[in-house]
């Protein structure tokens, strides 16, 4: 039968956990990204924010995973899902927030928002 929709989300959560736990030096050299509203279109917005960080191998798998949750192609400098761009935060903080919210979605049996 159909696969429970939570399985792919669990893979994303595991990768985010891996990043937060293995963080030794400042993640992505302390790069700053746009904060996002963790509401509708979160995955596309998260990707649009993170895609602007280049040369950071630690988050490349996360960027790639997020593309599987976003229906359209995302390129650097694209902000169609980032409705509000007024606050920048460190990538490490961004990943922590994203992890916290995806865990909530997972607990409530949601996958796509």
């Amino acid at each position: 039968g159909p696969v429970p929709p939570s399985t792919a989300l669990r893979e994303l959560i595991e990768e985010l956990v891996n990043i937060t736990q293995n963080q030794k030096a400042p993640l992505c050299n302390g790069s700053m990204v746009w904060s996002i509203n963790l509401t509708a279109g979160m995955y596309c917005a998260a990707l649009e924010s993170l895609i602007n960080v280049s040369g950071c191998s630690a988050i490349e798998k996360t960027q790639r995973m997020l593309s599987g949750f976003c229906p359209h192609k995302v390129s650097a400098g694209q902000f169609s899902s980032l409705h509000v761009r007024d606050t920048k935060i460190e990538v490490a903080h961004f990943i922590t927030k994203l992890l916290s919210y995806t865990k909530q979605l997972f607990r409530h049996g949601q996958q796509f928002n």
Partner: antibody
């Protein structure tokens, strides 16, 4: 280490049937979409079919629609391709491929390929 | 149906740059992947998301994609890069592979 091992290929007469299997290991099989891609002798790559990891959607190339059926057994970490009404032009090496995550798995990139199993359709 | 067109062959001298193009209608709006296939072997993903390299793929492989054309560039080409290369994209619920390009390293 991610591994994909195809089996079930062989010689079959036109109009016949064959079922290919792909045993997967080294990753959470149920989370990932999986595809079959084939390559006729001396020709290029041709995508055959895909089975998404989330929601269980299936996709087919026009050339096999109505004749081939993709399925998966997540408890056995195995992908299948049931091929009916086989034609000479179906002769090819068939590759099992680990595809992407999520509902838009096709955005991810086909990461891991098996070694392939050869299907020959001839009388 | 959607089509991706590649040149049948590209020749390059060792140490030089090889460029392979892949043309398709509004291809720049889609993610493009590139695969390398050596004789008797399974294909290997060398570029995903237009320009990203999977781990283990040498830095000499790079990609770009805009308008109707995606390009795979091999800088400082080595003998081991001699292979067939295929682009790939997703359109209307199907994967589409390019026609394939044979890269020959001269000498």
């Amino acid at each position: 280490e991610v591994q994909l091992l195809e089996s079930g290929g062989g010689l079959v007469q036109p109009g016949g049937s064959l079922r290919l299997s792909c045993a997967a290991s080294g990753f959470t099989f149920s989370s990932y979409a999986m595809s079959w891609v084939r390559q006729a002798p001396g020709k290029g790559l041709e995508w055959v079919s895909a089975f998404s990891g989330s929601g269980g959607s299936t996709y087919y190339a026009d050339s096999v629609k109505g004749r081939f059926t993709i399925s998966r057994d997540n408890s056995k970490n195995t992908l299948y391709l049931q091929m009916n009404s086989l034609r000479a032009e179906d002769t090819a090496v068939y590759y099992c491929v680990q595809d992407g995550l999520g509902p838009y798995f096709y955005n991810y990139g086909m990461d891991v390929w098996g070694q392939g199993t050869t299907v020959t359709v001839s009388s | 149906s959607y089509e991706l067109t590649q040149p049948p062959s590209v020749s390059v001298s060792p140490g030089q740059t090889a460029s392979i193009t892949c043309s398709g209608d509004k291809l720049g709006d889609k993610y493009t992947c590139w695969f390398q296939q050596k004789p008797g072997q399974s294909p290997v993903l060398v570029i995903y998301h237009d320009s990203k390299r999977p781990s283990g793929i040498p830095e000499r492989f790079s990609g770009s994609n805009s308008g109707d054309t995606a390009t795979l560039t091999i800088s400082g080409t080595q003998a081991m890069d001699e292979a067939d290369y295929y682009c790939q994209a997703w359109d209307s619920s199907t994967y589409v592979f390019g026609t394939g390009t044979k890269v020959t390293v001269l000498g």
